[in-house]
Interface confidence: low
Amino acid sequence: LYFSRDAYWEKLYVDQAAGTPLLYVHALRDAPEEVPSFRLGQHLYGTYRTRLHENNWICIQEDTGLLYLNRSLDHSSWEKLSVRNRGFPLLTVYLKVFLSPTSLREGECQWPGCARVYFSFFNTSFPACSSLKPRELCFPETRPSFRIRENRPPGTFHQFRLLPVQFLCPNISVAYRLLEGEGLPFRCAPDSLEVSTRWALDREQREKYELVAVCTVHAGAREEVVMVPFPVTVYDEDDSAPTFPAGVDTASAVVEFKRKEDTVVATLRVFDADVVPASGELVRRYTSTLLPGDTWAQQTFRVEHWPNETSVQANGSFVRATVHDYRLVLNRNLSISENRTMQLAVLVNDSDFQGPGAGVLLLHFNVSVLPVSLHLPSTYSLSVSRRARRFAQIGKVCVENCQAFSGINVQYKLHSSGANCSTLGVVTSAEDTSGILFVNDTKALRRPKCAELHYMVVATDQQTSRQAQAQLLVTVEGSYVAEEAGCPLSCAVSKRRLECEECGGLGSPTGRCEWRQGDGKGITRNFSTCSPSTKTCPDGHCDVVETQDINICPQDCLRGSIVGGHEPGEPRGIKAGYGTCNCFPEEEKCFCEPEDIQDPLCDELCR
């Protein structure tokens, strides 16, 4: 048994007579043999769930669900209630109605076995019938909505009449009907004004019925019509078995360069026309099991269940359904030497499905794990300016396909063949498994005998110690020019183009800082700033070279405070700035301020 609504509404007035009928509550059957029996909760409750008083005023007919006043609500009774609701002049109180023999504790009132009946209390007597508007004669203030379970026996779920109006205003005639399309499963009995279902409903065919209730009021010569929405929602049960969309039960996958833990290797989709179990219960009740194969496969892969609600068309209307994505995921990083082919099977079980048929599917994943070989090109040729500053990035080395790698840990090393010419260093970028070449020793750059540098690049896979090698030939170009006096260590300090381009700074490949002119569009990623190289700084990412020294690119790497209009970077630096941004790395501060368009001559004069 279940209630067709979770809440009912009616009005209560002072001194309404004992015996006044108030409203009907309705229960629908889950099985044909069920007989509803209603009981009231012991207490009246206030708007904030405050327990106001024992219910001494309202009774229920256990078999019919009719609520009525068994004694008049006089002023003293009203005070008894209002005083506990801290004297609000208009009080809404509610009662809990239970379906026997549902043994719910009074403290809990949840659909389907309990409904709340709300009474709007008016500290006046019932108004004169002639003063009631048609809307008040026809429908409660709060519009009802109904919930009916699919596949259940048909039954009565609503009674249109406002019982106190009918009881106290017998001379006013009120008639009701339902506006509905052809073949809809509802009827309104003209005599009793009860609304019932004609047959069991199927949610997978239609989930919502937006009906319209029409009320016609006859009072003397006047006739008025009132219309209100009458929505019915069909509640789901697990009556559909899971299926494969387009019959696809097998997915094939190749694991090669992406070998990192948590990588999604392949996905298979399962469709279920139901939307139960509800999301909170779904993963517990809709199970997926990777069937035992070899131990290696069990340790290496796991299956993740990702359910999502979707909507499908049925009989011209949309109904909700569920798609379940089952992802085969790497449980650990795979070594580059791993080389296997296997078939994995996953058992999916919709454990709530009662049939007919089975709620079980078998998913197949064909997986090939390929080994990865490390290859470097035979030779790299690069040039570097003699004026380059320490930490200047001059190029990259990268094993074949390194941009595509994940979960493969390659370390790069440089072995210098020239004596005392260890000018360059290399660091491995975590992002793309490449090695970034940078200037490590500027003194060596200036030595005449270091005009041509020869290195061996060695790439080593940390897990297997497999290696690849390549020659690196670096030509040192240009002549050295000493730094201007008074230049800061960091390009980022400079606030104006002129002073920026006069100086070099840590990380500068040319020995000169570069000015990046912003777009001037408010707080923007393209703010004006002074950088060692606009190729790498700022780019919204503090790279592995820039992390070596905060003076290289504080715009990307600063963890300190940023003053002025900006959007902070994640997890550090300036993501977007207003106007020009300059930084003082030693003080761990950056400033973003409007563009300064003063004439440089004025600057000199002002000094």
């Epitope: 904030y48 405050t50 003293s76 005070e79 008894k80 005083v83 801290r86 609000f88």
Partner: antibody, heavy 118, light 107 residues
Framework: EVQLVESGGGLVQPGGSLRLSCAAS????????MSWVRQAPGKGLEWVSG????????FYVDSMKGRFTISRDNSKNTLYLQMNSLRVEDTAVYFC???????????WGQGTLVTVSS | DIQLTQSPSFLSASVGDRVTITCWAS??????LAWYQQKPGKAPKVLIY???TLQSGVPSRISGSGSGTEFTLTISSLQPEDFAAYYC?????????FGQGTKLEIK
């Protein structure tokens, strides 16, 4: 002008009784809930008891139920707190407070000191 | 019974400072909370009720916010007369309960 004046406090031995009174003026006494709130020396506020405007409904903090009785005489605009079986821990300043319709205490008396000591 | 927990218990501040006192309820009390100020030897005085409504006659530098289980009292710019004890009180149901209090003293 709303005025609440408490009286009846004093020194009493453990196990003894006291009756506190609160004379109210400046508002329609029968319309409002009234409460007693106490404050032990150097401690915080503790709500003790409340009563509805007509006097038909009374409320107590659990630890005082059965020992304390709140009442009111609407013809005299007076609130009472009868305290029996007093304990040392009942030593406090007892305030009478008018409850606003919303529920908060918008007017308070000056308080009366109750000392329970042997 | 509904328990109220105030934080901090003691607060040192200077004239002109902005201070915030927090009150947590052991269960949802909607907006049914009041704040009181009490000076030594005096009766409490209501400042805020319904969590955020200023009692008439209370200066606008005092404000309240919150609902459910977390509430705050804020004094935007402390004045010499604001140094006192502050209490929150739930008005959701009997027995009414108070927080343990926050003593605001001059730094």
């Amino acid at each position: 002008e709303v005025q609440l004046v408490e009286s009846g406090g004093g020194l009493v031995q453990p196990g003894g009784s006291l009756r506190l009174s609160c004379a109210a003026s400046g508002f329609t006494f029968t319309t409002y809930f009234m409460s007693w709130v106490r404050q032990a020396p150097g401690k915080g506020l503790e709500w003790v008891s409340g009563i509805s405007g007509s006097g038909t409904s009374t409320f107590y903090v659990d630890s005082m139920k059965g020992r304390f009785t709140i009442s009111r005489d609407n013809s005299k605009n007076t609130l009472y707190l009868q305290m029996n079986s007093l304990r040392v821990e009942d030593t406090a300043v007892y305030f009478c407070a008018k409850e606003n319709t919303y529920g908060h205490f918008d007017f308070w008396g000056q308080g009366t000191l109750v000392t329970v000591s042997s | 019974d509904i328990q109220l927990t105030q934080s901090p218990s003691f607060l040192s501040a200077s004239v002109g400072d902005r201070v915030t006192i927090t009150c947590w309820a052991s269960q949802d009390i909607s907006s049914h909370l009041a704040w009181y100020q009490q000076k030594p030897g005096k009766a409490p005085k209501v400042l805020i009720y319904d969590a955020s409504t200023l009692q008439s006659g209370v200066p606008s530098r005092i404000s309240g916010s919150g609902s459910g289980t977390e509430f705050t009292l804020t004094i935007s710019s402390l004045q010499p007369e604001d140094f006192a004890a502050y209490y929150c009180q739930q008005l959701d149901g009997y027995p009414y309960t108070f927080g343990q209090g926050t003593k605001l003293e001059i730094k």
